[in-house]
Structures are given as structure tokens and as C-alpha cells.
């Protein structure tokens, strides 16, 4: 009896426990199943988001594979397009400066010739035959040979031919062609089916070759720079004028003294009106020449290097785009399927281990 009673008690306890478990199962399982099913929506949303974002996910993957091989060469060509524009500007400045310099230096020659004529006339004064004035007059006469302009300023050749060449190069919009290159890359995320097949149009390649042949690397920069370092006149005209004034002041008052002082004043005016503008022009010329020299230095080698990079990028795009797309599409597909595989594994684990 005791044993039976004990077993019945135990059975009731077990039955209670089982009923409790059954009640728990009946009460909680629907919630757990609901939770498991709810996780499907998260997985589905993740997959749908990737499908909806095929441009940035798949396209972005393709773009990330292509970009490192193409962007650097496009950047280089873009900087060369800027260099072409800067070259045109420098050549225009240089050409107009040279033409101004030519007229300015002829004008200086003319003015100096006139003042020398005037000084020679002044020195014909009878007072120049009398000591001690004769010594002053001789000293002035000997210094007249210094009143010359630099003839080489007039002989600097213009750069019309080089400017024409660069203007011809600029007829092709290299910047625009580079933009097309960037654009066709940037289009990839939106239009995977329309990948770029050309990095830069053939016109861009020819444009670079034409620029390399425009002649700015063969210009005789040294001859221009040599002149920018020279004085427009054979002597510092202000010093000459002050010296002439001092010599005039050592003479007795009269016509000779007055005419020499007038000539000294004329020389100061020549310095102000003729020499200073030439010095300004020479400074502008120097700056333009330096810009051109910088661009022209190693131009052919630089263009050759860019064209080689362009060939490499073009070959990469021609030969690898299809395989990149296939690889990235497979990767993209695997990513989406992976979301569902992960979900099913999690369900199996949840039901077998947790529920």
C-alpha cells in the first residue's frame, strides 16, 4: 500500500509537471514560432534591400574593382588638360609681352638717340673749349656711348607658332573627354549592363600627342631669360642723370649749364616713361617663361608615360570587365543566398536546441 501510494504521488507529481510543461508548450511555443518566423522577415528585408540596391551593391563591387586601374590615368590626363590651358595663357602673356617689349625698346632707343643728339649739341657750346669746363664736357662726351638701349630686346622672337599649335590642341575638349571617362565609370552602379569600354576617346590620345609636339619643350628659354636679367639701357639712367646734373652744377651759370640740366631731366623722364615699363614687361616675360619651362620640361616623357598608363587601363577594361562582372555577380548572388542559408541554420539550431 505504501509503495502504491508513493508511486501514485510520484505519478501525480510527474503528471502535474507534464501538464505544466504541456501548458507551457501550448502557451509559449506559438510565441517562439512567431519569433522564429519574424526573423524570416528580417532576412527577407536584408535580401530585398540588396536586390533593390543592386546598383550600389553589385555595381559598387564592380566599380571598386575597376576604379584603381582607371581613375589614376584619368586624373593624370585631367591634370594635363589643366596644363594645356595654363600653357596657352602663358604663351599669350609671353607673346603680347614680347610684342610690347619690341615697341617699348624701339621707343627707348629713339628717346636715347634724341637725348644724345641734344647732349652733343649742348657740348658744342664754346664754354666746352675753355678750361676747366672742357674737362667736364669731355667727361660727359665720353659717357654718351653708355646711353644705348639693349638691341637684343628687339630681337627676341615671338611665339606665334607655339601659340597656334596650343590653340589647335585646345580645339579638342580634353577636359570633356576625361569627364566622359569619369562619367562612364560612375554610371556603372546604375547601369551594370552598360560598362565603359573606352577609358578616353581616341581624340584624347591624339590631343596629348599634339600637345607633346607643340614645340614648348624646344623653345630657347635661356635666350629669353638672359634678356630678363639685363638692363634695358646700357647704364642705370637715373644714376647717369644725377651724375650729369652734378657735372652741370660744377659749370658756371649759363646756357651750357641750363641745357645739360634740361638733358638730365629728360633722361630722368626717359627712365620713368620708358625704362620702368620695359622692366615691368621683362618681369612679366620672366614669369611666363618660367611657367612654360616648367610645363615643357620633360613634356614628351610625361605624355609617353600617360599614354602607356592609358593603354594599360584600356587593356584592363577591355580584357577584364566581363570577368569582373561575372565574379561580382556570383559574389552578389552568394551574398543573398547566404542570408537565407544563415536563417535556415539558425531555425534548425533554435528548434532543436532552444524549443
Amino acid at each position: 500500500n505504501h509503495q502504491v501510494r508513493t508511486r501514485i504521488k510520484r505519478s501525480r507529481k510527474l503528471a502535474d509537471s507534464n501538464f505544466k510543461d504541456l501548458r507551457t508548450l501550448l502557451n509559449e511555443t506559438p510565441e517562439q514560432i512567431k519569433y522564429i518566423l519574424a526573423q524570416y522577415n528580417t532576412t527577407k528585408d536584408k535580401a530585398f534591400t540588396d536586390l533593390n540596391s543592386i546598383n550600389s551593391v553589385l555595381g559598387g563591387g564592380i566599380l571598386d574593382r575597376l576604379r584603381p586601374n582607371i581613375i589614376p590615368v584619368l586624373d593624370e590626363i585631367k591634370s594635363m588638360a589643366t596644363a594645356i590651358k595654363e600653357t596657352k595663357e602663358a604663351l599669350e602673356n609671353m607673346n603680347s609681352t614680347l610684342k610690347s617689349l619690341h615697341q617699348q625698346s624701339t621707343q627707348l632707343s629713339s628717346s636715347l638717340t634724341s637725348v644724345k643728339t641734344s647732349l652733343r649739341s649742348s657740348l658744342n657750346d664754346p664754354l666746352c673749349l675753355v678750361h676747366p669746363s672742357s674737362e667736364t664736357c669731355n667727361s660727359i662726351r665720353l659717357s654718351l656711348s653708355q646711353l644705348n638701349s639693349n638691341p637684343e630686346l628687339r630681337q627676341l622672337p615671338p611665339v606665334d607658332a607655339e601659340l597656334d599649335n596650343v590653340n589647335n590642341v585646345l580645339r579638342t575638349d580634353l577636359d570633356g573627354l576625361v569627364q566622359q571617362g569619369y562619367q562612364s565609370l560612375n554610371d556603372i552602379p546604375d547601369r551594370v549592363q552598360r560598362q565603359t569600354t573606352t577609358v578616353v576617346a581616341a581624340a584624347g590620345r591624339k590631343n596629348l600627342q599634339d600637345f607633346a609636339a607643340c614645340g614648348i619643350d624646344r623653345m630657347n628659354y635661356d635666350s629669353y631669360l638672359a634678356q630678363t636679367g639685363k638692363s634695358p639701357a646700357g647704364v642705370n639712367l637715373l644714376s647717369f642723370a644725377y651724375d650729369l646734373e652734378a657735372k652741370a652744377n660744377s659749370l658756371p651759370p649759363g646756357n651750357l649749364r641750363n641745357s645739360l640740366k634740361r638733358d638730365a631731366q629728360t633722361i630722368k623722364t626717359i627712365h620713368q616713361q620708358r625704362v620702368l615699363p620695359i622692366e615691368q614687361s621683362l618681369s612679366t616675360l620672366y614669369q611666363s617663361v618660367k611657367i612654360l619651362q616648367r610645363t615643357g620640361n620633360g613634356l614628351l616623357e610625361r605624355v609617353t608615360r600617360i599614354l602607356a598608363s592609358l593603354d594599360f587601363a584600356q587593356n584592363f577594361i577591355t580584357n577584364n570587365t566581363s570577368s569582373v562582372i561575372i565574379e561580382e555577380t556570383k559574389k552578389y548572388g552568394r551574398t543573398i543566398i547566404g542570408y537565407f542559408e544563415h536563417y535556415l541554420q539558425w531555425i534548425e539550431f533554435s528548434i532543436s536546441e532552444k524549443v
Partner: antibody, heavy 117, light 106 residues
Framework: EVKLVESGPELKKPGETVKISCKAS????????MHWVNQAPGKGLKWMGW????????SYADDFKGRFAFSLETSASTAYLQINNLKNEDTATYFC??????????WGQGTTLTVSS | DIVLSQSPAIMSASPGEKVTISCSAS?????MYWYQQKPGSSPKPWIY???NLASGVPARFSGSGSGTSYSLTISSMEAEDAATYYC?????????FGAGTKLELK
């Protein structure tokens, strides 16, 4: 193509005034100075002077100071040579010429001036 | 002013003959320029910077010289070369011309 076209022949009396024109085309007029050269019948070339086409400032050779005047009409790309109080010895052909560097690279066809009473 | 003296003033040459015209400057110049002029025409630039032929000038022409002494040479005279030739300097202001050398065909 650079061209300098001068006005036609002139027949004048002593004491009169003449104005010869030189119209430039094919380049930017203010880029190059304009020179005038005189050639008396059967004689050589004589430089008369020049005008700065940027500033309009003229310069004359010693033998051509006084009665001779250079001027410009920049908008018309034209240079002028005016000779006042004409004398018989002014009878000559007058050439305009542009100069870049240190020689005269383009010349007008010349204007023949005859001064006779 | 720099004076340019040309010699000879007049000369004649037969076709195929070598011709030399000289130009002497009263003081040293860096370059000499030469012009050709035919009757009734304007002068044409012929040789610039001493030895460079202007556009369209036949290769039988050449120029040489330095300092105060310059020359124009025709290696083989042709009928069309008969003209007056002027030397000119612009090294020193004002520019000056030589008196000219009249070259006739013999």
C-alpha cells in the same frame, strides 16, 4: 595673310598737304610698330621714322622732323603719313612697313607722290 | 647713325655666274638684313639675321659676315635675280639702309 594696302598715287602742288593711308590686315594691328620709308625717283631707301601702334607715339628720323606727321586710326587698323607744306623734293614713293624683330618684314605696295607746280 | 656702304653700286653678271655684293658698316652690328627690289615694286625681305633666307627665296642665295663686314652671295646667277639689293641694320637706332647695289643681267 598679312597685307598692307596703301592709298593711291597723289599729284600735289607745292605748299599743299597730303595724307597717305596704310591699311593693315591679317594680324593684330597693335602688335607691330609701323614704319615709313621714302624712296626718291632713282634713289635708295630712306627710313623716315615709325609710330608705336600700342601708344600712338611717333618718332621721326632727323631729316623728317617738322612737316611730317604719323598718326593712327586703330579701330580701322590704319596708319597715316601726313606731309604739310609740300615741296618739290618730297616727290617720292612712300612705303609703310611693319617691323617685328629688327627688320621690315611686310611692306605696302607704295604710294607715289608727285609735287609739281 | 651707323652708315652702311654697299659695293659695287652697279654690276652685271651672266647666267650661271657667281655674284657677291658687300656691305660695310661704320661700326659693329650684330646682324645684317638684305632686301630685293625690282622696278615698280616694294622691297622684299630677302635675307634676315645675316644668313637666314626669307620665305620663298631660292637656295642659290646666301648671306654671311660679322662685325662690320657682310655679304650677299648668289651661287649661280639667274635672269630673275636681276634687281637692286639693299643691306639694312637695326642693331643701333635709327635703322639705316645701304645705298643699294643694282644687279643687271649680262
Amino acid at each position: 595673310e598679312v597685307k598692307l594696302v596703301e592709298s593711291g598715287p597723289e599729284l600735289k602742288k607745292p605748299g599743299e598737304t597730303v595724307k597717305i593711308s596704310c591699311k593693315a590686315s591679317g594680324y593684330t594691328f597693335t602688335d607691330y610698330s609701323m614704319h615709313w620709308v621714302n624712296q626718291a625717283p632713282g634713289k635708295g631707301l630712306k627710313w623716315m621714322g615709325w609710330i608705336n601702334t600700342e601708344t600712338g607715339e611717333p618718332s621721326y628720323a632727323d631729316d623728317f622732323k617738322g612737316r611730317f606727321a604719323f598718326s593712327l586710326e586703330t579701330s580701322a587698323s590704319t596708319a597715316y603719313l601726313q606731309i604739310n607744306n609740300l615741296k618739290n623734293e618730297d616727290t617720292a614713293t612712300y612705303f609703310c612697313a611693319t617691323d617685328y624683330g629688327d627688320y621690315f618684314d611686310y611692306w605696302g605696295q607704295g604710294t607715289t607722290l608727285t609735287v609739281s607746280s | 647713325d651707323i652708315v652702311l656702304s654697299q659695293s659695287p653700286a652697279i654690276m652685271s653678271a651672266s647666267p650661271g655666274e657667281k655674284v657677291t655684293i658687300s656691305c660695310s658698316a661704320s661700326s659693329s652690328v650684330s646682324y645684317m638684313y638684305w632686301y630685293q627690289q625690282k622696278p615698280g615694286s616694294s622691297p622684299k625681305p630677302w635675307i634676315y639675321r645675316t644668313s637666314n633666307l626669307a620665305s620663298g627665296v631660292p637656295a642659290r642665295f646666301s648671306g654671311s659676315g660679322s662685325g662690320t663686314s657682310y655679304s650677299l652671295t648668289i651661287s649661280s646667277m639667274e635672269a630673275e635675280d636681276a634687281a637692286t639689293y639693299y643691306c639694312q641694320q637695326y642693331h643701333s637706332y635709327p635703322p639705316t639702309f645701304g645705298a643699294g647695289t643694282k644687279l643687271e643681267l649680262k
